[in-house]
């Protein structure tokens, strides 16, 4: 799986979770959330060669397309697979609200 | 929603689906496929802005982050949203034989 | 808090020779990429190197190839950066940054240590 345990040991030129600290007040400009200040979201980037954890038969297809025509810009791209929510606390007045953001940290990836 | 009914109509530069046709020998060096000889396979490119599509809460956390960081390449991608199977014919020796393969027409697309 | 202090860097002659450290704190250390990444006078970031978070692999800029060699003490949270053969152009202030800085440009946590090569 392309996850940290393989991709935070390997730093991999091709497609591959990356490391990413995001802070909510420096980075997105949001002031709203009282913590945490900020989290590891991660994301995903790196090449798609051939076979290289495709999605789908498209995904496959695609890669193989770019391989015999590499001057055309269709190939496929790497992007998250699994996704992890985060727990925030913000206020609304003076009354403290925990929520849960729904797919705000990337696990893995994939090539689609 | 990204598809062939607004995109192709559209031409636009940001995330949406183009046309793409495969033929199956010269592209990707299949010999094996009787019929077709090729397929509207179509791809998903173009750029992912702030709130163009975005497919998940993370992927707009990273679209303002790459608004707001322009010069980290930590941004979202444009990949196949829906995608529908292609049924070929084949031969085993002499023997025609009928398969659906599934996810490899890609129908629309979005930013993840 | 992530913090990240770089120390040990200083004038030195072409074909001179320094290394530079990173002291890490207030995140998992090994568990994460690290890279250097420095600014020459009036340019942009530009990346050096990367490590993987067990020390086994290692990518390297063009520029600085078969001169440059970074490691990390995963037991002292620190990143090093050997600097051999240098030469004038590898003047600039070096920066440490977790993760893999050639995916994620533009970002320095430290203050960072100033090299210049000059004879």
């Known amino acids: 799986a392309l996850d940290a345990a393989y991709c935070f040991r390997n730093v991999q030129d091709n497609c591959c979770l990356r490391p990413l600290y995001i802070d909510f007040k420096r980075d997105l400009g949001w002031k709203w959330i009282h913590e945490p200040k900020g989290y590891n979201a991660n994301f995903c980037a790196g090449a798609c060669p051939y076979l290289w954890s495709s999605d789908t038969q498209h995904s496959r297809v695609l890669s193989l397309y770019n391989t015999i025509n590499p001057e055309a810009s269709a190939s496929p791209c790497c992007v998250s697979q699994d996704l992890e929510p985060l727990t925030i606390l913000y206020y609304i007045g003076k009354t403290p609200k925990i929520e849960q953001l729904s797919n705000m940290i990337v696990k893995s990836c994939k090539c689609s | 929603a990204l598809d062939a009914a607004y995109c192709f109509r559209n031409v636009q530069d940001n995330c949406c689906l183009r046309p793409l046709y495969i033929d199956f020998k010269r592209d990707l060096g299949w010999k094996w496929i009787h019929e077709p000889k090729g397929y509207n396979a179509n791809f998903c490119a173009g750029a992912c802005p702030y709130l163009w599509s975005s497919d998940t809460q993370h992927s707009r956390v990273l679209s303002l982050y790459n608004t707001i960081n322009p010069e980290a390449s930590a941004s979202p991608c444009c990949v196949s949203q829906d995608l529908e199977p292609l049924t070929i014919l084949y031969y085993i020796g002499k023997t025609p034989k009928i398969e659906q393969l599934s996810n490899m027409i890609v129908k629309s697309c979005k930013c993840s | 808090q992530l913090q990240l202090v770089e120390s040990g860097g200083g004038l030195v002659q072409p074909g001179g020779s320094l290394t530079l450290s990173c002291a890490a704190s207030?995140?998992?250390?090994?568990?994460?990429?690290m890279s250097w990444v420095r600014q020459a006078p009036g340019k942009g970031l530009e990346w050096v190197s990367v490590?993987?978070?067990?020390?086994?692999?290692?990518h390297y800029s063009d520029s600085v190839k078969g001169r440059f060699a970074i490691s990390r003490d995963n037991a002292k949270n620190t990143l090093y950066l050997q600097m051999n053969s240098l030469k004038p152009e590898d003047t600039a202030v070096y920066y440490c940054?977790?993760?893999?800085?050639?995916?994620?440009?533009?970002?320095?946590r430290g203050q960072g240590t100033q090299v210049t090569v000059s004879s």
């Open positions: 940054a977790e993760g893999d800085s050639r995916y994620v440009r533009g970002r320095t």
């Open positions: 207030g995140f998992t250390f090994s568990l994460y990429p």
């Open positions: 490590i993987g978070s067990d020390g086994g692999t290692k």
